[in-house]
Amino acid sequence: ITQQDLAPQQRVAPQQKRSSPSEGLCPPGHHISEDGRDCISCKYGQDYSTHWNDLLFCLRCTRCDSGEVELSPCTTTRNTVCQCEEGTFREEDSPEMCRKCRTGCPRGMVKVGDCTPWSDIECVHKESGTKHSGEAPAVEETVTSSPGTPASPCS
């Protein structure tokens, strides 16, 4: 389900001369007028709609937070794509903010995955090869490494 599917301002347009099941919808980049007769463009850089819709308003463009970089700007048909800055990542269970990647693995573990905009570094036990999901290690325990380079969107 998309954000648009859940939009509170969605409604069924009034019946008109219907030549197709989907008449009364407006194309991506537009929303429907109050009377259901016209399609109104979203405002470039301000709001958008991604699908054929009967929204009374377009959806507001996301603004990238500090700590994020803008990968692509908002257009009338696509929301802004934001990505965590290098050295930070966004977890699925806390998508509202970018968190700092750990600088290294605990003693007895080796790094098998770099910091990316959507994941922390990945550590495994030297012997068993099992993943470590624990908290950031104490400074004296760490094996330092440099963060990876952001590569793709996380929003």
């Epitope: 991506p28 016209d38 463009s41 405002k43 470039y44 048909t77």
Partner: antibody, heavy 119, light 107 residues
Framework: QVQLVQSGAEVKKPGASVKVSCKAS????????LHWVRQAPGQGLEWMGW????????KYNEKFKDRVTITADKSTSTVYMELSSLRSEDTAVYYC????????????WGQGTLVTVSS | DIQMTQSPSFLSASVGDRVTITCRAS??????VAWYQQKPGKAPKLLIY???TRHTGVPDRFSGSGSGTDFTLTISSLQPEDVATYYC?????????FGGGTKLEIK
């Protein structure tokens, strides 16, 4: 390359109907909206309506709503515009034009079809 | 419906001149304006959309500006091949409407 090829010129009597075709090629037919725009001799351009093959959405300019019917044959990537109850002021070049599913500007146009309404 | 009023309706200029065509919308259309070039006996060609974005392959002597109700198409240095009629179009609200055209000729 993208091509919109329209049917040939037509001469019709007042009160008759005309059906103009527009065959699309060089792109995925179901990904773009196709429009009809007309231009009377020496006059400006007038948008008549659209058809979107992706979901069969049709929208007409209210001015033409009672007289125009836009249909399509997806198997041949062809869109049709039928205008009924013709009058002399419908004499015009009728263009099909394409736009992406976004802002309503037209990036490719057919060559135009001259429809002459004369008794 | 939104009326698009173009001026001038006719314009004569010399090769190399800077040419400006204006378009006024009867109500606010944000930046949802496109410009087309039409040569005699041919279909229109898209030049500019979103008031100022040049379409692929359009020479950079063509530029557009404006927002709200007042829009401008500028040809920075007129070339012989620019002889044509130019139309503005609002793509803000259906029915999408066009200006009456500006016929441009070389002096």
């Amino acid at each position: 390359q993208v091509q919109l090829v329209q049917s040939g010129a037509e001469v019709k009597k007042p009160g008759a109907s005309v059906k103009v075709s527009c065959k699309a090629s060089g792109y995925t037919f179901t990904e773009y909206i196709l429009h009809w725009v007309r231009q009377a001799p020496g006059q400006g351009l007038e948008w008549m309506g659209w058809f979107y093959p992706g979901n069969n959405n049709i929208k007409y300019n209210e001015k033409f709503k009672d007289r125009v019917t836009i249909t399509a044959d997806k198997s041949t990537s062809t869109v049709y515009m039928e205008l009924s109850s013709l009058r002399s002021e419908d004499t015009a070049v009728y263009y099909c034009a394409r736009h992406e599913q976004g802002p309503g500007y037209f990036d490719y146009w057919g060559q135009g079809t001259l429809v002459t309404v004369s008794s | 419906d939104i009326q698009m009023t173009q001026s001038p309706s006719f314009l004569s200029a010399s090769v190399g001149d800077r040419v400006t065509i204006t378009c006024r919308a009867s109500q606010d259309v944000n930046t949802a304006v496109a410009w087309y070039q039409q040569k005699p006996g041919k279909a229109p060609k898209l030049l500019i959309y979103w008031a100022s974005t040049r379409h692929t392959g359009v020479p950079d002597r063509f530029s557009g500006s404006g927002s709200g109700t007042d829009f401008t198409l500028t040809i920075s240095s007129l070339q012989p091949e620019d002889v044509a009629t130019y139309y503005c179009q609002q793509h803000y609200i259906t029915p999408w409407t066009f200006g009456g055209g500006t016929k441009l000729e070389i002096k």
